[in-house]
């Protein structure tokens, strides 16, 4: 299936909105920096069939959506930006869902590499644990915002590679 051009625009919009959501200087939070162990190898796109790559992308975006839909998140960010960001994520989830339904068709392509999905989930569990340990402080959220910008950039690159495969 073709991921629509609007999908990549949505990606860019999501990244721009996430950048705009920053409230405090990243430099004032250097002491809170943390390595969350982003599973880069799951986003290089080489070892996947397309449906599996879409499933990993969906997992990444769904977990991001979950993270930014919590009450703690609502308290941390400016509401209109948060809502616009969440709307972009939701639209991407819809695009990916429609795409994978076409992709698997009746040929019954495997839908996932379970290890990849679990790697993404564990990554988000580490982020959630970090926020809990830091008591959802402004600096903790800033570190997480910067981390999600980085991981969404990896997702964007994988989506570009998928489009080149079409």
């Amino acid at each position: 299936c073709d991921l629509p051009q609007t999908h990549s625009l949505g990606n860019r919009r999501a990244l721009i909105l996430l950048a705009q959501m920053g409230r405090i200087s990243h430099f004032s939070c250097l002491k809170d920096r943390h390595d969350f162990g982003f599973p880069e190898e799951e986003f290089d796109g080489h070892q996947f069939q397309k449906a599996q790559a879409i499933s990993v992308l969906h997992e990444m975006i769904q977990q991001t959506f979950n993270l930014f839909s919590t009450e703690d998140s609502s308290a941390a960010w400016e509401q209109s930006l948060l809502e616009k960001f969440s709307t972009e994520l939701y639209q991407q989830l819809n695009d990916l869902e429609a795409c994978v339904i076409q992709e698997v068709g009746v040929e019954e392509t495997p839908l996932m590499n379970e290890d990849s999905i679990l790697a993404v989930r564990k990554y988000f569990q580490r982020i959630t644990l970090y926020l809990t340990e830091k008591k959802y402080s402004p600096c903790a959220w800033e570190v997480v915002r910067a981390e999600i910008m980085r991981s969404l950039s990896f997702s964007t690159n994988l989506q570009k590679r998928l489009r080149r495969k079409d």
């Epitope: 499933s55 990993v56 969906h58 809502e83 939701y90 339904i101 698997v104 068709g105 839908l111 679990l118």
Partner: antibody, heavy 126, light 110 residues
Framework: EVQLLESGAEVKRPGSSVRVSCRAS????????ISWVRQAPGQGLEWMGR????????NYAQNFRGRITITADKSPLTAYLELSSLRFEDTAVYYC???????????????????WGQGSLVTVSS | EIVLTQSPGTLSLSPGEGATLSCRAS???????LTWYQQKPGQSPRLLIY???SRATGVPDRFSGGGSGTDFTLTISRLEPEDFAVFYC???????????FGQGTKVEIK
Amino acid sequence: EVQLLESGAEVKRPGSSVRVSCRASGDTFSSYPISWVRQAPGQGLEWMGRILPALGVTNYAQNFRGRITITADKSPLTAYLELSSLRFEDTAVYYCASPSADIIPSILGTTLFAFWGQGSLVTVSS
Amino acid sequence: EIVLTQSPGTLSLSPGEGATLSCRASQNVSRHYLTWYQQKPGQSPRLLIYGGSSRATGVPDRFSGGGSGTDFTLTISRLEPEDFAVFYCQSYHSPPPVYTFGQGTKVEIK
């Protein structure tokens, strides 16, 4: 684990409206849709529509468009079903249902109903 | 819109016997988007099988799902007394999201 608790039974007149609520507790996410599914006495299951509480986005089954409104509150996470212009054939048990965030991969999560409310009986009678 | 037709309408069997329930779609459905539920009298439905063949948490391994294209099956290898119920298949399609249920198969004690 998610628990879904629906409001009590209702008796309504034809032509009137009914509002059923569904309160979610446990490992809930407002980023997953909550659906409404109904079951007429002795009949099968029929999906009516769903809402994504995080954004208030709704999708309705063709059969109910124009008569159905689904809304939600994020805190506490609660979904509401309003059905208007009630007819005798709307007599049914109304269930709210939600997916599971534990389903792997998440792209399958929203395609199914892992958790169900206990059901709310709506009787339309003159 | 997809129509799911389940057969037989009723299956009369004894505990210990095997059961095969059929769900036929009016057009192709990916097995990934085919789900089975069990409903006992006076209870809410319970998720059994998703993704065509994955058992939900706590579902015994005597339940299995299979099939592809337009023909899907739910197999119960050895019926236990607690298995007698109505079973529904359900498919999903998007966009827009549409959930479709079969009319159900009742498995009753002979």
